[in-house]
Interface confidence: low
């Protein structure tokens, strides 16, 4: 039950995270004009990864896409790439994780296959989240750099020199959405990886069977069977005792005719 809950919760958290990453990528308010030092009160500028917008005091807003790559910082292109990679990986991860969900039955898919798919989707979510966090952080760093550059430029460029002065920009709402969404996707991925360990039967536990043979009292307790999934190890072939209460996610094997060889 715990594994199913962990897997389901991981899926939902990742789904919300990826939706957030998509929203952040599409949002226009990645950076907004710093109103504290705004030389123009009539116009408020803000921009995203794909277009730039101007909102007037009247409420009229007009947005214009970046139709050319010329003049756009290389870092902005890198941020775009990171966000797109994050979305693509996240989308693939979601697709894989749907089929990996324990509550969904697809043919005669074994638990080991579901475990592998859960792990794959988990890793994809982790990488997706990291891509989003990295993209937003690179953009934020670029803004901070430009913020201080602009402040410095205000006091330079005298003596007839041609000087481009940049207005200050500060963090937009999309940055915070991106950070939170990336974090959620990352957490969801970790939860999927944790759920994967519970899905993969590391050892098949047999109930102890007592029987008499030739007048001698023998308690037969088979050693742990190592699953070929590659998760964990049981090198010491330790004895496994029945702990009593078990969850529905644990493998429960009962004695069969093969136990009485």
């Amino acid at each position: 039950m715990a594994v199913t809950a962990c897997q389901g919760l991981g899926f939902v958290v990742s789904l919300i995270g990826i939706a957030g990453i998509i929203a952040a990528t599409c949002m226009d308010q990645w950076s907004t004009q710093d109103l504290y030092n705004n030389p123009v009160t009539a116009v408020f500028n803000y921009q995203g990864l794909w277009r730039s917008c101007v909102r007037e005091s009247s409420g009229f807003t007009e947005c214009r896409g970046y139709f050319t790559l010329l003049g756009l910082p290389a870092m902005l292109q890198a941020v775009r790439a990171l966000m797109i990679v994050g979305i693509v990986l996240g989308a693939i991860g979601l697709l894989v994780s749907i089929f990996a969900l324990k509550c969904i039955r697809i043919g005669s898919m074994e638990d080991s296959a579901k475990a592998n798919m859960t792990l794959t989707s988990g890793i994809m979510f982790i990488v997706s989240g990291l891509c989003a966090i990295a993209g937003v952080s690179v953009f934020a760093n670029m803004l901070v750099t430009n913020f201080w550059m602009s402040t410095a430029n205000m006091y330079t460029g005298m003596g007839g020199m041609v000087q481009t002065v940049q207005t200050r920009y500060t963090f937009g709402a999309a940055l915070f959405v991106g950070w939170v969404a990336g974090g959620l996707t990352l957490i969801g991925g970790v939860m999927m990886c944790i759920a994967c360990r519970g899905l993969a039967p590391e050892e098949t536990n047999y109930k102890a069977v007592s029987y008499h043979a030739s007048g001698h009292s023998v308690a037969y307790k088979p050693g742990g069977f190592k699953a070929s999934t590659g998760f964990g190890s049981n090198t010491k072939n330790k004895k496994i005792y029945d702990g009593g209460a078990r969850t529905e996610d644990e493998v429960q094997s009962y004695p069969s005719k093969h136990d009485y060889v």
Epitope: Q33, N45, S52, R64, L70, G71, P73, Q166, Y169
Partner: nanobody, 114 residues
Framework: EVQLVESGGGLVQPGGSLRLSCAAS????????MGWFRQAPGKGRELVSR???????NYADSVKGRFTISRDNSKNTLYLQMNSLRAEDTAVYYC????????WGQGTLVTVSS
């Protein structure tokens, strides 16, 4: 690299005309917001006129009917035609472009005096 270079400023008598030019490089003037701002001695910077990428134009109330903003896409240049100049129009005029960030030229001085 994005750069803006203004020209056309100078001394002019009240009622006279001037045409300011702003040569842009690093982007196309038709694909972004561009505008003219001015800063009179001891005063803050104010918006004179703005032209959006789509062609929408705005003017400050004080210059409506006297100033005309335009752009030449082939020359990648923004213009400000100033007619019926007054003494209060004396200021440093800045060309500005909003292309992912705000970019400003170095400014050109316009003096209206008799």
């Amino acid at each position: 690299e994005v750069q803006l270079v203004e020209s056309g400023g100078g001394l002019v008598q009240p009622g006279g005309s001037l045409r300011l030019s702003c040569a842009a490089s690093g982007f196309t003037v038709s694909s972004t917001y561009m505008g003219w701002f001015r800063q009179a001695p001891g005063k803050g910077r104010e918006l004179v006129s703005r032209i959006a990428g789509g062609g929408q134009i705005n003017y400050a109330d004080s210059v409506k009917g006297r100033f005309t903003i335009s752009r030449d896409n082939s020359k990648n240049t923004l213009y400000l035609q100033m007619n019926s100049l007054r003494a209060e129009d004396t200021a440093v005029y800045y060309c500005a472009a909003h292309y992912w960030m705000d970019y400003w030229g170095q400014g050109t001085l316009v003096t209206v005096s008799s």
